[in-house]
Interface confidence: medium
Protein backbone atom coordinates (compact mmCIF):
# COMPACT_ATOMS: atom_id res chain seq x y z
CA UNK A 1 0.00 0.00 0.00
CA UNK A 2 1.42 3.33 -1.03
CA UNK A 3 0.46 6.84 -0.12
CA UNK A 4 0.98 9.81 -2.38
CA UNK A 5 2.59 12.26 0.00
CA UNK A 6 3.23 15.84 -1.02
CA UNK A 7 6.09 17.14 1.10
CA UNK A 8 6.13 20.69 -0.18
CA UNK A 9 9.17 21.81 1.76
CA UNK A 10 11.36 18.96 0.49
CA UNK A 11 10.22 17.89 -2.95
CA UNK A 12 9.29 19.54 -6.22
CA UNK A 13 6.25 17.28 -6.76
CA UNK A 14 4.30 14.35 -5.37
CA UNK A 15 6.39 11.40 -4.20
CA UNK A 16 5.30 7.89 -3.31
CA UNK A 17 6.01 6.99 0.31
CA UNK A 18 4.93 3.64 1.79
CA UNK A 19 2.25 3.74 4.47
CA UNK A 20 3.33 0.81 6.59
CA UNK A 21 6.64 -0.37 7.98
CA UNK A 22 5.99 -3.87 6.70
CA UNK A 23 6.87 -2.57 3.23
CA UNK A 24 9.88 -0.57 4.34
CA UNK A 25 11.87 0.00 7.48
CA UNK A 26 12.03 0.10 10.37
CA UNK A 27 13.12 3.73 10.50
CA UNK A 28 13.48 6.26 13.29
CA UNK A 29 10.27 8.06 14.12
CA UNK A 30 9.23 10.73 11.57
CA UNK A 31 11.87 9.68 9.06
CA UNK A 32 10.96 8.96 5.43
CA UNK A 33 11.24 5.31 4.47
CA UNK A 34 11.76 4.62 0.79
CA UNK A 35 13.00 1.45 -0.90
CA UNK A 36 14.78 0.11 2.19
CA UNK A 37 16.41 3.40 3.08
CA UNK A 38 15.49 5.87 5.82
CA UNK A 39 15.93 9.56 5.10
CA UNK A 40 15.58 12.69 7.16
CA UNK A 41 15.93 16.24 5.94
CA UNK A 42 17.22 18.67 8.59
CA UNK A 43 16.30 22.32 8.25
CA UNK A 44 18.92 23.77 10.55
CA UNK A 45 22.04 24.97 8.77
CA UNK A 46 25.31 23.42 9.89
CA UNK A 47 28.73 23.07 8.33
CA UNK A 48 29.64 19.69 6.84
CA UNK A 49 31.39 18.41 9.96
CA UNK A 50 28.53 19.41 12.25
CA UNK A 51 26.07 17.85 9.83
CA UNK A 52 28.05 14.63 9.83
CA UNK A 53 28.14 14.60 13.64
CA UNK A 54 24.39 15.20 13.79
CA UNK A 55 23.71 12.22 11.54
CA UNK A 56 26.14 10.03 13.46
CA UNK A 57 24.43 10.91 16.75
CA UNK A 58 21.28 9.35 15.27
CA UNK A 59 23.04 6.19 14.08
CA UNK A 60 22.92 7.44 10.52
CA UNK A 61 25.30 9.00 8.02
CA UNK A 62 25.04 11.88 5.62
CA UNK A 63 23.31 11.02 2.36
CA UNK A 64 25.11 8.52 0.15
CA UNK A 65 23.94 8.21 -3.45
CA UNK A 66 24.46 4.63 -4.56
CA UNK A 67 21.61 3.84 -6.97
CA UNK A 68 19.42 6.03 -9.13
CA UNK A 69 16.80 3.31 -9.24
CA UNK A 70 16.62 2.73 -5.48
CA UNK A 71 16.89 6.42 -4.69
CA UNK A 72 14.73 7.90 -7.41
CA UNK A 73 12.93 10.14 -4.92
CA UNK A 74 16.17 12.15 -4.81
CA UNK A 75 15.43 13.39 -8.33
CA UNK A 76 12.79 15.64 -6.83
CA UNK A 77 14.63 17.11 -3.86
CA UNK A 78 14.45 20.89 -3.56
CA UNK A 79 17.35 23.19 -2.74
CA UNK A 80 20.87 22.18 -1.65
CA UNK A 81 21.79 19.88 1.22
CA UNK A 82 25.03 18.47 2.56
CA UNK A 83 25.68 14.85 1.61
CA UNK A 84 28.42 12.48 2.74
CA UNK A 85 30.77 13.18 -0.14
CA UNK A 86 34.23 14.66 0.38
CA UNK A 87 37.16 15.43 -1.88
CA UNK A 88 40.42 13.79 -0.81
CA UNK A 89 43.19 16.19 -1.92
CA UNK A 90 45.96 13.60 -1.57
CA UNK A 91 44.61 11.37 -4.34
CA UNK A 92 42.12 13.72 -5.96
CA UNK A 93 39.13 11.42 -5.62
CA UNK A 94 35.64 12.08 -4.34
CA UNK A 95 34.81 9.62 -1.57
CA UNK A 96 31.81 8.80 0.55
CA UNK A 97 32.06 8.74 4.34
CA UNK A 98 32.52 4.97 4.23
CA UNK A 99 35.61 5.37 2.02
CA UNK A 100 34.03 4.17 -1.21
CA UNK A 101 34.86 6.12 -4.36
CA UNK A 102 32.11 8.06 -6.12
CA UNK A 103 30.97 6.39 -9.32
CA UNK A 104 30.85 9.08 -12.04
CA UNK A 105 27.59 7.68 -13.39
CA UNK A 106 25.67 8.55 -10.22
CA UNK A 107 26.30 12.26 -9.78
CA UNK A 108 27.26 15.14 -12.00
CA UNK A 109 29.78 17.13 -9.96
CA UNK A 110 29.57 20.89 -10.54
CA UNK A 111 32.28 23.23 -9.32
CA UNK A 112 30.15 25.99 -7.77
CA UNK A 113 32.78 27.00 -5.22
CA UNK A 114 36.27 25.96 -4.26
CA UNK A 115 35.99 23.33 -1.58
CA UNK A 116 36.26 19.72 -0.53
CA UNK A 117 32.64 18.92 0.35
CA UNK A 118 29.56 18.52 -1.79
CA UNK A 119 25.94 19.56 -1.63
CA UNK A 120 23.22 17.38 -3.09
CA UNK A 121 20.73 19.05 -5.43
CA UNK A 122 17.88 17.64 -7.49
CA UNK A 123 18.41 15.41 -10.51
CA UNK A 124 21.52 13.76 -9.09
CA UNK A 125 23.79 16.77 -9.08
CA UNK A 126 26.58 17.47 -6.62
CA UNK A 127 27.77 21.02 -6.05
CA UNK A 128 31.25 21.57 -4.66
CA UNK A 129 31.19 23.81 -1.60
CA UNK A 130 33.50 24.91 1.19
CA UNK A 131 33.04 22.45 4.06
CA UNK A 132 32.70 25.23 6.62
CA UNK A 133 29.72 26.84 4.90
CA UNK A 134 26.45 26.28 6.79
CA UNK A 135 23.80 24.35 4.87
CA UNK A 136 20.84 22.11 5.53
CA UNK A 137 21.61 18.40 5.34
CA UNK A 138 20.19 14.96 4.65
CA UNK A 139 20.80 11.99 6.91
CA UNK A 140 20.36 8.43 5.69
CA UNK A 141 20.12 5.03 7.31
CA UNK A 142 20.16 1.75 5.41
CA UNK A 143 17.52 -0.70 6.64
CA UNK A 144 19.07 -3.81 5.08
Amino acid sequence: IWSAVFLNSLFNQEVQIPLTESYCGPCPKNWICYKNNCYQFFDESKNWYESQASCMSQNASLLKVYSKEDQDLLKLVKSYHWMGLVHIPTNGSWQWEDGSILSPNLLTIIEMQKGDCALYASSFKGYIENCSTPNTYICMQRTV
Epitope: K68, H87, G92, S93, I101, P104, N105, T108, S123
Partner: antibody, heavy 117, light 107 residues
Framework: QVQLVQSGAEVKKPGASVKVSCKAS????????MNWVRQAPGQGLEWMGR????????HYNQKFQGRVTMTVDKSTSTAYMELSSLRSEDTAVYYC??????????WGQGTLVTVSS | DIQLTQSPSSLSASVGDRVTITCRAS??????LAWYQQKPGKSPKVLVY???TLADGVPSRFSGSGSGTDYTLTISSLQPEDFATYYC?????????FGGGTKVEIK
Amino acid sequence: QVQLVQSGAEVKKPGASVKVSCKASGYTFTSYWMNWVRQAPGQGLEWMGRIDPYDSETHYNQKFQGRVTMTVDKSTSTAYMELSSLRSEDTAVYYCAKMGDYSFDYWGQGTLVTVSS
Amino acid sequence: DIQLTQSPSSLSASVGDRVTITCRASGNIHNYLAWYQQKPGKSPKVLVYNAKTLADGVPSRFSGSGSGTDYTLTISSLQPEDFATYYCQHFWSTPWTFGGGTKVEIK
Protein backbone atom coordinates in the same frame (compact mmCIF):
# COMPACT_ATOMS: atom_id res chain seq x y z
CA GLN B 1 29.97 -9.55 -21.97
CA VAL B 2 29.51 -5.85 -22.66
CA GLN B 3 28.97 -4.97 -26.30
CA LEU B 4 28.22 -1.73 -28.12
CA VAL B 5 27.16 -2.30 -31.72
CA GLN B 6 26.88 0.73 -33.97
CA SER B 7 25.00 1.30 -37.20
CA GLY B 8 26.71 1.18 -40.58
CA ALA B 9 28.63 3.77 -42.57
CA GLU B 10 26.77 6.77 -43.98
CA VAL B 11 27.38 9.16 -46.85
CA LYS B 12 25.65 12.52 -46.53
CA LYS B 13 25.49 15.78 -48.43
CA PRO B 14 26.47 19.09 -46.82
CA GLY B 15 23.56 20.57 -44.89
CA ALA B 16 21.96 17.19 -44.25
CA SER B 17 21.64 15.34 -40.91
CA VAL B 18 22.88 11.95 -39.82
CA LYS B 19 21.64 9.71 -37.02
CA VAL B 20 23.98 7.04 -35.67
CA SER B 21 22.73 4.28 -33.39
CA CYS B 22 24.52 2.30 -30.69
CA LYS B 23 22.90 -0.84 -29.31
CA ALA B 24 24.16 -1.85 -25.88
CA SER B 25 24.09 -5.29 -24.31
CA GLY B 26 25.70 -7.16 -21.43
CA TYR B 27 25.09 -4.56 -18.73
CA THR B 28 22.32 -2.45 -17.17
CA PHE B 29 21.85 0.21 -19.83
CA THR B 30 20.28 2.82 -17.53
CA SER B 31 23.09 2.70 -14.97
CA TYR B 32 25.91 4.14 -17.07
CA TRP B 33 26.29 7.31 -19.07
CA MET B 34 26.76 6.92 -22.80
CA ASN B 35 29.26 9.19 -24.52
CA TRP B 36 29.88 10.06 -28.14
CA VAL B 37 33.38 10.68 -29.45
CA ARG B 38 34.46 11.42 -32.99
CA GLN B 39 37.71 11.09 -34.85
CA ALA B 40 38.39 12.83 -38.16
CA PRO B 41 40.64 10.95 -40.62
CA GLY B 42 44.20 10.91 -39.30
CA GLN B 43 43.24 13.13 -36.36
CA GLY B 44 42.75 12.76 -32.62
CA LEU B 45 39.72 12.04 -30.48
CA GLU B 46 37.05 14.63 -29.73
CA TRP B 47 34.39 14.28 -27.01
CA MET B 48 30.98 15.39 -28.30
CA GLY B 49 28.86 14.89 -25.21
CA ARG B 50 27.07 12.38 -23.05
CA ILE B 51 23.59 11.21 -22.16
CA ASP B 52 22.33 9.58 -19.00
CA PRO B 53 20.03 6.76 -20.19
CA TYR B 54 18.33 6.77 -16.79
CA ASP B 55 16.59 10.11 -17.35
CA SER B 56 17.88 11.27 -20.77
CA GLU B 57 19.80 14.17 -19.24
CA THR B 58 22.38 15.37 -21.77
CA HIS B 59 25.58 17.37 -21.55
CA TYR B 60 27.02 18.50 -24.86
CA ASN B 61 30.40 19.86 -25.78
CA GLN B 62 29.78 23.56 -26.44
CA LYS B 63 31.39 23.13 -29.86
CA PHE B 64 28.45 20.98 -30.98
CA GLN B 65 25.67 22.71 -29.04
CA GLY B 66 22.71 23.36 -31.31
CA ARG B 67 23.80 20.79 -33.89
CA VAL B 68 23.92 17.58 -31.88
CA THR B 69 21.06 15.69 -30.28
CA MET B 70 21.59 12.61 -28.15
CA THR B 71 18.68 10.35 -27.27
CA VAL B 72 18.08 6.85 -25.95
CA ASP B 73 15.46 4.17 -26.31
CA LYS B 74 15.46 2.32 -23.01
CA SER B 75 13.20 -0.44 -24.33
CA THR B 76 15.86 -1.52 -26.82
CA SER B 77 18.96 -0.33 -24.87
CA THR B 78 19.94 1.84 -27.80
CA ALA B 79 21.59 5.25 -27.82
CA TYR B 80 21.38 7.65 -30.74
CA MET B 81 23.44 10.62 -31.84
CA GLU B 82 22.07 12.97 -34.48
CA LEU B 83 24.25 15.65 -36.02
CA SER B 84 22.63 18.26 -38.22
CA SER B 85 23.81 20.91 -40.71
CA LEU B 86 26.63 18.64 -41.77
CA ARG B 87 29.75 20.08 -43.36
CA SER B 88 32.83 18.47 -44.85
CA GLU B 89 34.73 18.88 -41.56
CA ASP B 90 32.22 16.50 -39.95
CA THR B 91 33.62 13.62 -41.95
CA ALA B 92 34.82 11.31 -39.21
CA VAL B 93 34.41 8.02 -37.42
CA TYR B 94 31.82 8.42 -34.67
CA TYR B 95 32.09 6.22 -31.59
CA CYS B 96 29.73 5.56 -28.73
CA ALA B 97 31.51 4.81 -25.47
CA LYS B 98 30.19 3.60 -22.12
CA MET B 99 31.25 5.51 -19.04
CA GLY B 100 33.19 3.42 -16.57
CA ASP B 101 35.22 4.48 -13.55
CA TYR B 102 36.37 7.85 -14.87
CA SER B 103 37.19 6.37 -18.22
CA PHE B 104 35.36 5.11 -21.28
CA ASP B 105 35.64 1.41 -20.58
CA TYR B 106 33.81 0.03 -23.64
CA TRP B 107 33.61 1.47 -27.13
CA GLY B 108 31.51 0.75 -30.17
CA GLN B 109 33.23 -0.32 -33.37
CA GLY B 110 32.76 3.13 -34.88
CA THR B 111 30.58 4.50 -37.66
CA LEU B 112 32.18 6.31 -40.59
CA VAL B 113 30.20 9.34 -41.67
CA THR B 114 31.35 10.91 -44.93
CA VAL B 115 30.08 14.35 -45.87
CA SER B 116 30.55 15.04 -49.54
CA SER B 117 28.73 16.87 -52.28
CA ASP C 1 38.06 24.55 -20.80
CA ILE C 2 40.94 22.33 -19.69
CA GLN C 3 43.43 21.70 -22.49
CA LEU C 4 45.67 18.61 -22.52
CA THR C 5 49.06 18.75 -24.19
CA GLN C 6 50.72 15.42 -24.92
CA SER C 7 54.39 15.00 -25.61
CA PRO C 8 56.03 13.83 -27.63
CA SER C 9 53.58 13.73 -30.54
CA SER C 10 55.49 10.73 -31.89
CA LEU C 11 58.45 8.59 -30.89
CA SER C 12 60.45 5.72 -32.27
CA ALA C 13 61.43 2.91 -29.95
CA SER C 14 62.58 -0.68 -29.99
CA VAL C 15 61.09 -3.77 -28.39
CA GLY C 16 62.22 -3.90 -24.76
CA ASP C 17 62.65 -0.12 -24.46
CA ARG C 18 61.16 1.87 -21.59
CA VAL C 19 58.77 4.44 -23.00
CA THR C 20 57.38 7.50 -21.22
CA ILE C 21 54.56 9.69 -22.52
CA THR C 22 53.54 12.87 -20.75
CA CYS C 23 50.25 14.72 -20.58
CA ARG C 24 50.11 18.27 -19.22
CA ALA C 25 46.78 19.87 -18.29
CA SER C 26 46.13 23.61 -18.44
CA GLY C 27 44.64 23.40 -14.93
CA ASN C 28 44.54 21.05 -11.96
CA ILE C 29 42.54 17.96 -12.95
CA HIS C 30 42.88 16.25 -9.56
CA ASN C 31 43.99 12.85 -10.93
CA TYR C 32 40.86 12.51 -13.08
CA LEU C 33 42.88 11.32 -16.05
CA ALA C 34 42.61 8.25 -18.26
CA TRP C 35 44.98 6.81 -20.84
CA TYR C 36 43.90 4.95 -23.98
CA GLN C 37 45.62 2.90 -26.63
CA GLN C 38 44.39 2.95 -30.22
CA LYS C 39 45.57 0.82 -33.10
CA PRO C 40 44.87 1.71 -36.75
CA GLY C 41 41.27 1.00 -37.76
CA LYS C 42 40.32 0.00 -34.20
CA SER C 43 38.43 1.60 -31.34
CA PRO C 44 40.41 3.02 -28.40
CA LYS C 45 41.00 0.79 -25.38
CA VAL C 46 41.36 2.11 -21.84
CA LEU C 47 44.66 1.36 -20.11
CA VAL C 48 44.63 3.52 -16.98
CA TYR C 49 42.04 5.59 -15.13
CA ASN C 50 42.21 7.89 -12.10
CA ALA C 51 45.77 8.65 -13.25
CA LYS C 52 47.27 5.44 -11.88
CA THR C 53 44.70 2.63 -11.70
CA LEU C 54 45.28 -0.09 -14.27
CA ALA C 55 42.14 -1.13 -16.13
CA ASP C 56 41.07 -4.78 -16.09
CA GLY C 57 43.16 -7.03 -18.31
CA VAL C 58 45.88 -4.46 -18.98
CA PRO C 59 49.44 -5.85 -18.69
CA SER C 60 51.45 -4.68 -15.70
CA ARG C 61 54.14 -3.20 -17.93
CA PHE C 62 51.80 -0.21 -18.29
CA SER C 63 51.66 2.25 -15.42
CA GLY C 64 50.32 5.72 -14.82
CA SER C 65 51.55 8.40 -12.45
CA GLY C 66 51.31 12.10 -11.76
CA SER C 67 49.13 14.64 -10.00
CA GLY C 68 47.88 18.17 -10.36
CA THR C 69 48.62 19.17 -13.94
CA ASP C 70 51.35 16.69 -14.95
CA TYR C 71 50.77 13.03 -15.74
CA THR C 72 52.79 10.21 -17.25
CA LEU C 73 52.11 6.89 -18.93
CA THR C 74 55.04 4.50 -18.78
CA ILE C 75 55.58 1.25 -20.67
CA SER C 76 58.36 -0.50 -18.79
CA SER C 77 59.36 -2.88 -21.58
CA LEU C 78 57.85 -2.20 -24.98
CA GLN C 79 56.30 -5.22 -26.69
CA PRO C 80 55.49 -5.64 -30.42
CA GLU C 81 51.78 -5.25 -29.73
CA ASP C 82 52.33 -1.91 -28.00
CA PHE C 83 53.07 0.00 -31.18
CA ALA C 84 50.00 2.24 -31.39
CA THR C 85 48.76 5.74 -30.66
CA TYR C 86 48.16 6.73 -27.04
CA TYR C 87 45.74 9.39 -25.80
CA CYS C 88 45.13 10.97 -22.43
CA GLN C 89 41.72 12.30 -21.41
CA HIS C 90 40.58 14.26 -18.37
CA PHE C 91 37.33 13.99 -16.43
CA TRP C 92 37.57 17.00 -14.13
CA SER C 93 35.09 19.36 -15.78
CA THR C 94 33.34 19.19 -19.11
CA PRO C 95 34.24 19.20 -21.91
CA TRP C 96 36.19 16.03 -21.26
CA THR C 97 38.98 16.81 -23.69
CA PHE C 98 41.60 14.43 -25.06
CA GLY C 99 45.27 15.07 -25.60
CA GLY C 100 46.50 15.25 -29.17
CA GLY C 101 47.94 11.73 -29.10
CA THR C 102 51.38 10.13 -29.11
CA LYS C 103 52.24 7.72 -31.91
CA VAL C 104 54.69 5.03 -30.82
CA GLU C 105 56.49 3.63 -33.87
CA ILE C 106 59.07 0.91 -34.41
CA LYS C 107 62.62 2.18 -34.62
